[in-house]
Interface confidence: medium
C-alpha cells in the first residue's frame, strides 16, 4: 500500500526528520511549512494550523526557503566607487562591486563593503603583481636594464632599448637614448628631413624599422647619394 502523505502540520515519526521545505518547530513539536523565497513567516504554525506566509516589504528580501519572522533588509545603496551588479528584489539582496581601477579592501558575504583605489606604481617602479577584484597592485623597483617612466597601476618594467651607440644611458625611470653613428654631412641640395621611425610601446619610445608605426619625429637624417650608414636608424 502507498504510504500516507502527511499534510503540514504533522508530528514526525520518532527519529525521522521533516521533509524538504519543511521545518521542525521545537515548541509545537510539529513539521511545518517553510515560506518560499520572497516571503516570510507572518504566523507560525500550531498543532492544528500551518505557517502563514506573507510577501517581503519593499527593500527587504529572503533568498531561501525560510521561516523567519521578518525579511532581511537589503544593503544600503552602492557608494560612488561601486557598481550595483545585482539590484535589491524581494528574493535577493543588492550586490555592490568595485568599479574599474578599484579593488575590494573589505568584502562581505556577497559583494564588497569597502573599495579602495588600485595602487599606482611611480616611475622607476613597475607592476610585480596586478590588482584583482580583492587585492591591490604590488609594485617592485625596476631591475637593472629595465625601466618604467609612467605612474600606472598596470605598466610593468620594460627592457631598455638596445643601442649600437648610447647617447644617454637608461635608468630605472628612463629608457636609453640612442645616437646615430653616421658621419655628419652637410645637407645636400634637396635634402629631405626624414622622421626617425618610432614605435609606441605602452608610452615608452623605442626605434623600430617599420615606418607604419612612426607617429613622432625623433632625429633628422641627411638624404645623400649613398645609403645611410649602419645604425643611423638608431638601432
Amino acid at each position: 500500500l502507498p504510504a500516507q502523505v502527511a499534510f503540514t502540520p504533522y508530528a514526525p515519526e520518532p527519529g525521522s526528520t521533516c521533509r524538504l521545505r519543511e521545518y521542525y518547530d521545537q515548541t509545537a513539536q510539529m513539521c511545518c511549512s517553510k515560506c518560499s523565497p520572497g516571503q516570510h513567516a507572518k504566523v507560525f504554525c500550531t498543532k492544528t494550523s500551518d505557517t502563514v506566509c506573507d510577501s517581503c516589504e519593499d527593500s527587504t528580501y529572503t533568498q531561501l526557503w525560510n521561516w523567519v519572522p521578518e525579511c532581511l533588509s537589503c544593503g544600503s545603496r552602492c557608494s560612488s566607487d561601486q557598481v550595483e551588479t545585482q539590484a535589491c528584489t524581494r528574493e535577493q539582496n543588492r550586490i555592490c562591486t568595485c568599479r574599474p581601477g578599484w579593488y575590494c579592501a573589505l568584502s562581505k558575504q556577497e559583494g564588497c563593503r569597502l573599495c579602495a583605489p588600485l595602487r599606482k606604481c611611480r616611475p622607476g617602479f613597475g607592476v610585480a603583481r596586478p590588482g584583482t577584484e580583492t587585492s591591490d597592485v604590488v609594485c617592485k623597483p625596476c631591475a637593472p636594464g629595465t625601466f618604467s617612466n609612467t605612474t600606472s597601476s598596470t605598466d610593468i618594467c620594460r627592457p631598455h632599448q638596445i643601442c649600437n651607440v648610447v647617447a644617454i644611458p637608461g635608468n630605472a625611470s628612463m629608457d636609453a637614448v640612442c645616437t646615430s653613428t653616421s658621419p655628419t654631412r652637410s645637407m645636400a641640395p634637396g635634402a629631405v628631413h626624414l622622421p626617425q621611425p618610432v614605435s609606441t610601446r605602452s608610452q615608452h619610445t623605442q626605434p623600430t624599422p617599420e615606418p607604419s608605426t612612426a607617429p613622432s619625429t625623433s632625429f633628422l637624417l641627411p638624404m645623400g647619394p649613398s645609403p645611410p650608414a649602419e645604425g643611423s636608424t638608431g638601432d
Epitope: Q26, T27, V43, F44, T46
Partner: nanobody
Framework: EVQLVESGGGLVQAGGSLRLSCAAS????????MGWHRQVPGKGRELVAG???????NYADSVKGRFTISSDNVKNTVYLQMNSLKAEDSGVYFC??????????????WGQGTQVTVSS
Amino acid sequence: EVQLVESGGGLVQAGGSLRLSCAASGSIVSTNGMGWHRQVPGKGRELVAGIRSDGFTNYADSVKGRFTISSDNVKNTVYLQMNSLKAEDSGVYFCYYQALSSPNYGQTFWGQGTQVTVSS
C-alpha cells in the same frame, strides 16, 4: 554557539512546587522558542512545556493546569513554574533554545539538564 544554564531543580515532596530557570547566552540574536523537555531512564526526551517568541505555548497533557511556562526576552531566560508536583514528574529536565537567526538558524541547543525528584 548558544550556552544554556539551568537552575532550580532538586528534591521536593509530592504536592510541592519548584521553579526552574534557564538562561541563554552566547550568539543570541533571535529565538524561535525556548522550553523544557523531560527525560526519565529508559525513555526519550519529551516536551514538558515550550514558549515561542510569538507567545504560542505548548504543554504536555500530563502537566496542563499544574505547570506554567513564561519567558523574559530581555534576559533571554525561560521559567517553568511547577505546582502540585507528582512522583511521575520526576526526571532530568533539559532546557532547549531554538535559534531563529544566523549563524545558527533553525538549530536547537540544549542545556546540561537539572534533576527534579518528587518523593511520595
